[in-house]
Interface confidence: low
């Protein structure tokens, strides 16, 4: 039997992973290979309760490997190089069950910042232009914008328009978030609106 | 230490049902298989079936299907095991083991049921 | 099913002596396991994988054999060793144990 559709499991960059395996029950486990983008990672032979026979054929990840008492891969310090396919075989006697998994890699999103170019306009009307970011983005990073809960913009640009003498008090939250890490940073209309305001009176006088 | 406690003994009418629990401690609970193996009166061990506590997979002895059924609660480290339309030949001491790498390696106190009119 | 056949289904001997047991199964099977049953307790795993002893088994016990034909033997029967003795096979669903070889002192 084989599952054909691959686990997508994902891991954080200098973090540990498991790839959790489930063996068939009640069959004697006679070995287990886990390979790793098709090249053999480790083989593994039951031989006491306590200690298997671990085979560590690839020396690269071989220091960062380890098993549980289950055969679960555990992988630890992830490095970007560990994305990939992961496939363990078990063999009993009668069949060989395989066990398929994706492994992506992904930073912890750090330092989420908002920058803000605006302008007022004669009618005191405050256009708000917005831009988030995260260090080293990358393309599994997505972003949003919500205004009480609402969600405003899919990107991370986001252009509003602010009228002080109609419009209550309003935070905008930029959303940064990938598949292990999720951050928030959120801006007030009114007090963006409020230094836009200075800097233009600023330059009247 | 690795310990499993079963439940007390139970004294049943035929065609009633017993439920068995076996309460699993100093290990990982869903990191090995629960067997369960029964002993009549005088005789012989007979393997009645396991379960994955990890993800609740099951396998029978045939002669058993349809009247055992295996469960395992995550949440407090159990295993039970129900028979059901009992007859006076299910009749035995009824014990949980834990199975290490390949073999049974720590097991239950055992559980009389008697099935008696 | 696969039956394995334990002989002799009980046993005497004096202390010192050397005792073997065998266990046949009615078709190849990988591997035999050994369990130990004293009266009124569990069973205790005792040769596992048909010739590798169990955590706190004497050396005195060993096993051996291939296919259908297994032979557990004791070198040197000392009283704490008065029990029953199966095997069992994990090659087939449903997995059988032996009947049992009861073992007494002279």
């Known amino acids: 039997q084989s599952s054909l559709t691959p686990l997508m499991v994902n891991g954080i960059l200098g973090e540990s992973v498991t790839l959790p395996l489930e063996f068939p029950a009640g069959e004697k486990v006679n070995f287990i290979t886990w390979l790793f983008n098709e090249t053999s990672l480790a083989f593994i032979v039951p031989h006491e309760t306590k200690s298997p026979e671990i085979h560590v054929t690839n020396p690269k990840q071989g220091k960062r490997l380890n098993f549980t008492q289950s055969y679960s891969l555990q992988l630890s310090n992830l490095k970007m190089e560990d994305t990939g396919s992961y496939r363990a075989q078990i063999s009993t006697k009668t069949s060989a069950k395989l066990s398929s998994y994706t492994l992506r890699i992904l930073r912890q999103l750090r330092n989420i910042q908002v920058t803000n170019h605006s302008q007022l306009f004669q009618n005191m009307t405050c256009e708000l232009h917005l831009t988030c970011s995260v260090e080293d983005a990358d393309d599994n990073v997505s972003f949003r914008w919500e205004a009480l809960g609402n969600t405003l913009s899919s990107q991370p640009n986001l252009t509003v328009s602010w009228d002080p003498r109609i419009s209550s008090e309003q935070d905008y939250t930029c959303i940064a978030e990938n598949a292990v890490s999720n951050l928030s940073f959120s801006v007030s209309a009114q007090k963006l609106c409020e230094d836009v305001k200075i800097q233009y009176t600023d330059t009247k006088m | 230490q690795v310990q499993l406690v079963q439940s007390g003994a139970e004294v049943k009418k035929p065609g009633a049902s017993v439920k068995v629990s076996c309460k699993a401690s100093?290990?990982?609970?869903?990191?090995?298989?629960i067997e369960w193996v029964r002993q009549a009166p005088g005789q012989g061990l007979e393997w009645i079936g396991v379960i994955n506590p990890g993800s609740g997979g099951t396998n029978y002895n045939e002669k058993f299907q349809g009247r055992v059924t295996l469960t395992a609660d995550k949440s407090i480290s159990t295993a039970y095991m129900e028979l059901s339309r009992l007859r006076s030949d299910d009749t035995a001491v009824y014990y949980c083991a834990r199975r290490g790498w390949d073999y049974f390696d720590y097991w239950g106190q055992g559980t009389l049921v008697t099935v008696s009119s | 099913d696969i039956q394995l056949t334990q002989s002799p289904s009980s046993l005497s001997a004096s202390v010192g002596d050397r005792v073997t047991i065998t266990c046949q199964a009615s078709q190849d099977v990988s591997y035999i396991y050994w369990y130990q049953q004293k009266p009124g307790k569990a069973p205790k795993p005792w040769i596992y994988?048909?010739?590798n002893l169990a955590t706190g088994v004497p050396s005195r016990f060993s096993g051996s054999g291939s296919g259908t034909d297994y032979t557990f033997t004791i070198s040197s029967l000392q009283p704490e060793d008065i029990a029953t003795y199966y095997c069992q096979q994990w090659d087939n669903n449903p997995y059988t144990f032996g009947q049992g070889t009861k073992l007494e002192i002279k």
């Open positions: 100093g290990y990982a609970f869903t990191n090995y298989l």
């Open positions: 994988r048909t010739s």
